[in-house]
């Protein structure tokens, strides 16, 4: 049996172990345990009782077992918890273990990026360019791209997209910058910053610019 599940960063992951062969076998007759891809044990339920001595230190205090639907809850999920988990339902006679069922769960962890925020690097004056920076923080998985959209244009603008990853949390932050000037005859512009991930597009609040006086020097960068 193989399943996929998703959890939010700092949230709870649900690792199921549906015992399709249950019939007349009760939890008190079984050994049920979960292990990660490094074979480290997250939780063990031994003949009806929690068994903590086999649990790896990194999972101690982070799990709870729902005996009604045979699901392990993994709390305070971190990016490093991504990966595969096996649940084993076993019997342990004197002749050695018998696996009655094995369920593989593939866990992915997501963190919503903050709403992209456009910041103005300097005041807008008639004959100077506008320098903008857009940032979005603490998301996962790695974003695809970030760009600026400008009034009445379908082009994607941006000079310097940078993605960084926090060494501890493994969350991503992304920024992009743009330098622009008012084109000839344009007195008003609206700029929006868009972050694209695998699953969604997130837009910043629009930023409006009005030119203070006509500028003879008009150009895009």
């Amino acid at each position: 049996v193989s399943v996929e599940t998703q959890a939010y960063f700092n949230g709870t992951a649900y690792l199921p172990c549906p015992f399709t062969k249950a019939q007349n076998i009760s939890l008190s007759e079984l050994v049920v345990f979960w292990q990660d891809q490094q074979k480290l044990v997250l939780y063990e339920h031994y003949l009806g009782t929690e068994k903590l001595d086999s649990v790896n230190a990194k999972y101690l205090g982070r799990t709870s077992f729902d005996r009604n639907n045979w699901t392990l809850r993994l709390h305070n999920v971190q990016i490093k918890d991504m990966g595969s988990y096996d649940c084993f339902i076993q019997k342990k006679p004197p002749t050695g273990s018998i696996i009655l069922q094995q369920t593989l769960t593939e866990l992915s962890v997501i963190a919503n990026f903050s709403e992209p925020e456009i910041k103005l690097a300097q005041n807008v004056t008639g004959n100077s360019g506008i320098n903008l920076t857009c940032t979005s923080k603490q998301g996962h998985p790695k974003p695809k791209k970030m760009y600026f959209l400008i009034t009445n244009s379908t082009n994607e603008y941006g000079d310097n997209m940078q993605i960084s990853q926090d060494n501890v949390t493994e969350l991503f932050s992304i920024s992009n910058s743009l330098s622009l000037s008012f084109p000839d005859g344009v007195w008003h512009m609206t700029v929006v910053c868009v972050l694209e991930t695998e699953s969604m597009k997130i837009s910043s609040k629009p930023l409006n610019f009005t030119q203070e006086f006509p500028s003879p020097q008009t150009y895009w960068k």
């Epitope: 003949l47 019997k91 006679p93 002749t95 696996i99």
Partner: antibody, heavy 115, light 113 residues
Framework: EVQLVESAGGLVQPGRSLKLSCAAS????????MAWVRQAPTKGLEWVAT????????YYRDSVKGRFTISRDNAKTILYLQMDSLRSEDTATYFC????????WGQGVMVTVSS | DIVMTQTPSSQAVSAGEKVTMSCKSS????????????LAWYQQKPGQSPKLLIY???TRESGVPDRFIGSGSGTDFTLTISSVQAEDLADYYC?????????FGSGTKLEIK
């Protein structure tokens, strides 16, 4: 889909050796005990040997102890049965099976020990 | 060694009939630690590999029709086929995996009249 496929057996003279293999697929081989069972022509089933999931423990029936060796390669997902000093009474179809509960079986391979 | 005795050695029944076969072990297969009986039943059709029907004395393997019923505890076990079908023609073996060496019964041959 779980599959167990034994290698070809054959005719072997008494006192000689033969190595059987069983290629496993469709499950995490390294998590499961594995066994060999045999069946002489027109006879019943007879357990031969069992090996633990990691290969650290092996168990044999008395009549093959010291002559047969069960082993496994978890990287290649193959189970082996090395049969030495073969006797006529070892003539049988040999099956590999998953676990001592034998929930999956190979198709079987015939081994004939005769001069 | 635990000796497994199966009776009868053969049995002929008509389709639709109920059939029972017995398996007795020379010592108890009930494991006190988990209160489980470590006995399995297998079906072997002519020219085929055996197939697991019942494990832990009474738990039906996935995909096995519910006309196959395992019962018993300790040393006395029974396999019942509530309404025999033509495709049930086969040899039936019980097996203990409570102790090494693992042992099988000598089998019950089911023939259809």
């Amino acid at each position: 889909e779980v599959q167990l496929v034994e290698s070809a057996g054959g005719l072997v003279q008494p006192g000689r050796s033969l190595k059987l293999s069983c290629a496993a697929s469709g499950f995490t081989f390294s998590d499961y005990y594995m066994a060999w069972v045999r069946q002489a022509p027109t006879k019943g089933l007879e357990w031969v040997a069992t090996i633990s999931h990691d290969g650290s423990s092996t168990y044999y029936r008395d009549s093959v102890k010291g002559r047969f060796t069960i082993s496994r390669d978890n990287a290649k997902t193959i189970l082996y049965l090395q049969m030495d000093s073969l006797r006529s009474e070892d003539t049988a179809t040999y099956f590999c099976a998953r676990q001592n509960i034998m929930d999956y079986w190979g198709q079987g391979v015939m081994v004939t020990v005769s001069s | 060694d635990i000796v497994m005795t199966q009776t009868p050695s053969s049995q002929a029944v008509s389709a639709g009939e109920k059939v029972t076969m017995s398996c007795k072990s020379s010592q108890s297969l009930l494991y006190s630690r988990d209160q489980s009986n470590y006995l399995a039943w297998y079906q072997q059709k002519p020219g085929q590999s055996p197939k697991l029907l019942i494990y832990l004395a009474s738990t039906r393997e996935s995909g096995v029709p519910d006309r196959f019923i395992g019962s018993g505890s300790g040393t006395d076990f029974t396999l019942t086929i509530s309404s025999v079908q033509a495709e049930d023609l086969a040899d039936y073996y019980c097996q203990q995996h409570y102790n090494y060496p693992l042992t099988f019964g000598s089998g019950t041959k089911l023939e259809i009249k």
